[in-house]
Structures are given as structure tokens and as C-alpha cells.
């Protein structure tokens, strides 16, 4: 990430609200618990590559693998979601590339109404059969972990049986679990063996146990709930862009900058400029020039078009985003050729008409 | 967890200058901005301004550019906010916090002959 | 500058009750706006991001919403705890303003 001299001032926002335009999201990689998961780094020419989860550092564990370019995620649960980055760290700069990942599937949380199957769990027993509580539905009760964004509704279930027909109860960190321990309370469905926690909140986070019993014996089980909860971001940059160009003397080209933030973003374009001759401030800082930012008076701040081009605009183009959370930036080169000869392809060029014929 | 330090209390006479710290914790701290609110007695809140620590970018209200200044040390993950040429209305509560999500317990100043 | 203006100043409401403080903004924020609660001698707190989304930590009785130039803060059952002064903010563009304020009292 540069640090410079301004030749313009580059503020925290512009005077004038931003214009809207299109956010790109990033690339989400989705899977359902118990899956494995794997994600190759795509930037290029790292020599050092790291990894972060939501801003912190990700480190190997014994279901994070990290090997060279690739994340691999074993038996993966939906903590494991979140917003990831990787970063080339190279001898000059370094980049960084975002993705989701979001790992989830239909049972972890939902109304009440979707047990259709909840008659198969209220299992009848013959009155001369006398048995102790038992778990008629293993398979509904595997996902111990339930991580859910906050204001969903959670539903824990024990579907049992046994003779006389077992009663259930909830304990919450161990405790009896009370109507008034949470602000709405929540609803127990007997007939589904179910508990339903509607409008989630942090504190609702714990340990939830169901006790099903009867006068012949005792069974429990222990969900964990995570309440999962999204703070504002700064601002991310799609990798690989803006990507240098090349273009002739006269030639047209655009940059372009895909931004990815939940808070209004602004987006300067800024250049190394010279000042008197030099291209560096007393304090060693390089000179840049803001050449766009969004605001009333910008066209789609997303992409800079350069038209006409001479040599004095080849250089080194950022695209600088901020909100009132954050900062990122990325840069691109401009390649100036004389008239006569033909541009090169880098990555991903929009050139000039001219190229084009 | 996320947490922001501030500087103790401070009395100072009209025209002299004050430097607040806030010491942040918990987190990245190159990564996010750290804006500074005032909060004059039984008055509302007035944001000041921001620097974003990982490049010293500063952004400031215009009531306050003149005589506020923002700096950061990322070797102790420190904020400072300097306001000089200090008059009776300058006597409040300044607040940092990082992108207004958490927030430091407040500095009192005040100023008074 | 964006102007914020909140309203009203202050309400008396029971315990139970359903509240609703209203923030208007000068100009259109595009749902930029922040509500915080501030309770004497304590740190503002950040309770809604983005006019809708509830931070971390906050009761789920708050709730946010409006768009555009108008905005809304409602608690769907006032609580004893939630006497405070509540404060919404243009972060859109800087200087980020805030309202006046909404001191929110027990009857």
C-alpha cells in the first residue's frame, strides 16, 4: 500500500454524495457441513503467501491445511464461513484477494413449519414394553454446531421415544433454560421434540441441552449456537484489477476498479505526477494527482477513461477506495507506444480503437 | 477483543495546547480509521476528524482543521489528537473510535483560567 | 455539510411501549446512517449500521429502517435500560454529522 505526497488532496469522502453504481461482490465459494473445501490463491508471482478469516490471521490446524497457493478446509462447519483473503507478499508490494465462503445448509435454522416429517418422530410404544428414552432420529442431531446470523430463527431437535412417552426439557449452559431468560422467550414443539428460538441475538449464544426422560432412565444431548454477526467492512478490491494496459500514442484506454463494501464507498483515481521537475516530495514521497473521484459530477467512478493519450500519461495508475471504515488500493501500469508500433497484450487491456482494427 | 485506551484528564489554560492518546488493541490496527468525536457539556456529538493509520491519510472536520491535528504510531498502535490555541468552549469529552464501531471511554479537557 | 435533524428532542414513554425516533438528512445518504445510544457518563455506542443492520451485541428490540433523506429508529418494548440520548449520523460523506439527539426517559 503506498504512502505519498499530495499534490490534490485526497479526503476521507468527497463534499458531494457519491453517485450510485453497481458493488461487485466476492467470488463465494459455498459448502454444506462435513465437506471439504479447497481454494487455490489466485494472484501470481507470490513469494510468501498468508491467509485471514474475517481480518485475522489464519494459521494451519488439525482441519486448516495451507500448502503453498492452497486453502484447504476439512470437514468444514458453518464457523468456518466468513470473509477470507489471501496476500502475495512480494520483494516490492504486495496484493490481496477476497472471497466468501459460506458454509450452510437447510437444517440449521428455520420456522417451526417445516416438519413435515414430525409425526415420524413421535414414535408410539406398545404399553407392555417398557423402555427407557431412547434417540429415534440420529441423523437430525449429528449437527451439534449451529452457527447462524443474528435475527434468524434457530430449531434444536431431540426426536426420541420411549415407554411411557419420555417428557423433554431444555437447559441452557447447564441451567434450566426460562421463558425470561431471552427477551420473546421461545417455543418448545413437544409433538416435533423441538426447540425454536426466533430473532437470535449475541446473547442467545451458548450451550442448549435437551433432557429426555422418563421413570425408566435419562438421555441427553448438547447443541452449541454461535449468533453470528456481520460488522461494516472496508472496503475490497477485486484482484487482478484495475489490470496495466498498453496502448499507442492517441490511443483511448480505460482502467477499471470493481469495488466490493457495505458503506458507501469513495473512489479516487490518482497518478504519479511530477512537482518542479521532481517526481518525489522533501519527505521523499512520491507526488500523485487525484484524477477522478465519485461524487455528483463523475460518471461511473469505477472506470477511468484515458482518451488521446500521450506519453506523459504512461505511469502508474491507483485506484484508491475508501469508506468511513477503511482503505484499500490497487494499482496498474500504462505502457505508451510510439505510433508506429503495435501494443503487447498484459492481462486484461481495453484499448483504443485504433488496436482494435 | 477490540479495545481503545485513552488518555487520562486534563485542565489547561486558554491558549495552550493538549495532546489526548488512544492506545488501540485487539485488532489490525493498520486497517481501519480512527475517528475523534466531541462532546461539549450538554451539548450533542461533533465529529472532528480521522486518520487512517496504515498511510497517516487525515481527513478533518472544517471547524476543527486549523487547530487539530491527527498522528498515528503504529509501532504502539497509538493514536494522538493535538488541539491547540485551547478556549473555554474547547472544554469537553473527545471520544476516538475505530470506524465508529468501538469506542474509547473518553478524555474530559478542560479549559479554564 | 449535510444537515441531520431528529426529532423529537425528547419522549417519555412506559416500559413496554413501542418507541420511534425519527432522523431527517439535508440531502439523500443512500442509507448511510449510523444510530448510537449514549448513556450519562458512558461511551456512545453503535446500535444500527447502514440505516437497517443491528451491530453486534444489540437487542433485537431495536431496529432501523428509511431511506433517502428519511430514517427511523424504533424499539418494538421500551425497556428500563434503555433510558439513554440516541444520536443518528450521516457517514455518507465528512464531516460526518450527527442529529441533535433524542433524550428517551421512563414515564
Known amino acids: 500500500r503506498p504512502s505519498f505526497s499530495l499534490v490534490e488532496d485526497t479526503t476521507l469522502e468527497p463534499e458531494e454524495p457519491p453517485t450510485k453504481y453497481q458493488i461487485s461482490q466476492p467470488e463465494v465459494y459455498v459448502a454444506a457441513p462435513g465437506e471439504s473445501l479447497e481454494v487455490r490463491c489466485l494472484l501470481k508471482d507470490a513469494a510468501v503467501i498468508s491467509w485471514t478469516k474475517d481480518g485475522v490471521h489464519l494459521g494451519p490446524n488439525n482441519r486448516t491445511v495451507l500448502i503453498g497457493e492452497y486453502l484447504q478446509i476439512k470437514g468444514a462447519t458453518p464457523r468456518d464461513s466468513g470473509l477470507y483473503a489471501c496476500t502475495a507478499s512480494r520483494t516490492v508490494d504486495s496484493e490481496t484477494w477476497y472471497f466468501m465462503v459460506n458454509v450452510t445448509d437447510a437444517i440449521s435454522s428455520g420456522d417451526d413449519e417445516d416438519d413435515t416429517d414430525g409425526a415420524e418422530d413421535f414414535v408410539s410404544e406398545n404399553s407392555n414394553n417398557k423402555r427407557a428414552p431412547y434417540w429415534t432420529n440420529t441423523e437430525k442431531m449429528e449437527k451439534r454446531l449451529h452457527a447462524v446470523p443474528a435475527a434468524n430463527t434457530v430449531k434444536f431437535r431431540c426426536p426420541a421415544g420411549g415407554n411411557p412417552m419420555p417428557t423433554m426439557r431444555w437447559l441452557k449452559n447447564g441451567k434450566e433454560f426460562k421463558q425470561e431468560h431471552r427477551i420473546g422467550g421461545y417455543k418448545v414443539r413437544n409433538q416435533h421434540w423441538s426447540l425454536i428460538m426466533e430473532s437470535v441475538v449475541p446473547s442467545d449464544k451458548g450451550n442448549y441441552t435437551c433432557v429426555v426422560e422418563n421413570e425408566y432412565g435419562s438421555i441427553n444431548h448438547t447443541y452449541h449456537l454461535d449468533v453470528v454477526e456481520r460488522s461494516p467492512h472496508r472496503p475490497i478490491l477485486q484482484a487482478g484489477l484495475p489490470a496495466n494496459a498498453s496502448t499507442v500514442v492517441g490511443g483511448d484506454v480505460e482502467f477499471v476498479c470493481k469495488v466490493y463494501s457495505d458503506a458507501q464507498p469513495h473512489i479516487q483515481w490518482i497518478k504519479h505526477v511530477e512537482k518542479n521537475g521532481s517526481k518525489y516530495g522533501p519527505d521523499g514521497l512520491p507526488y500523485l494527482k487525484v484524477l477522478k473521484h465519485s461524487g455528483i459530477n463523475s460518471s461511473n467512478a469505477e472506470v477511468l477513461a484515458l482518451f488521446n493519450v500521450t506519453e506523459a500519461d504512461a505511469g502508474e495508475y491507483i485506484c484508491k477506495v475508501s469508506n468511513y471504515i477503511g482503505q484499500a488500493n490497487q494499482s496498474a501500469w500504462l505502457t505508451v507506444l510510439p505510433k508506429q508500433q503495435a501494443p503487447g497484450r498484459e492481462k486484461e487491456i481495453t484499448a483504443s480503437p485504433d488496436y482494435l482494427e | 477483543q477490540v479495545q481503545l485506551v485513552q488518555s487520562g484528564a486534563e485542565v489547561k489554560k486558554p491558549g495552550a495546547s493538549v495532546k489526548v492518546s488512544c492506545k488501540a488493541s485487539g485488532y489490525i490496527f493498520r486497517n481501519y480509521y480512527i475517528h475523534w468525536v466531541k462532546q461539549a457539556p450538554g451539548q450533542g456529538l461533533e465529529w472532528m476528524g480521522a486518520i487512517y493509520p496504515d498511510n497517516g491519510d487525515t481527513s478533518y472536520n472544517q471547524r476543527f482543521k486549523v487547530r487539530a491535528t491527527l498522528t498515528a504510531d503504529t509501532s504502539t498502535s497509538t493514536v494522538y489528537m493535538e488541539l491547540s490555541s485551547l478556549r473555554s468552549e474547547d472544554t469537553a469529552v473527545y471520544y476516538c473510535?475505530?470506524?465508529?464501531?468501538?469506542w474509547g471511554q473518553g478524555t474530559t479537557v478542560t479549559v479554564s483560567s | 455539510d449535510i444537515q441531520m435533524t431528529q426529532s423529537p428532542s425528547s419522549l417519555s414513554a412506559s416500559v413496554g411501549d413501542r418507541v420511534t425516533i425519527t432522523c431527517g438528512a439535508s440531502?439523500?445518504?443512500?442509507?448511510?446512517l449510523n444510530w448510537y445510544q449514549r448513556k450519562p457518563g458512558k461511551s456512545p455506542k453503535l446500535l444500527i449500521y447502514g440505516a437497517t443492520n443491528l451491530a453486534d451485541g444489540v437487542p433485537s428490540r431495536f431496529s432501523g429502517s428509511g431511506s433517502g433523506t428519511d430514517y427511523t429508529l424504533t424499539i418494538s418494548s421500551l425497556q428500563p435500560e434503555d433510558v439513554a440520548t440516541y444520536y443518528c449520523q450521516n457517514v455518507l460523506s465528512t464531516p460526518y454529522t450527527f442529529g441533535g439527539g433524542t433524550k428517551l426517559e421512563i414515564k
Open positions: 440531502e439523500n445518504i443512500y442509507g448511510a
Open positions: 473510535a475505530r470506524a465508529f464501531t468501538y
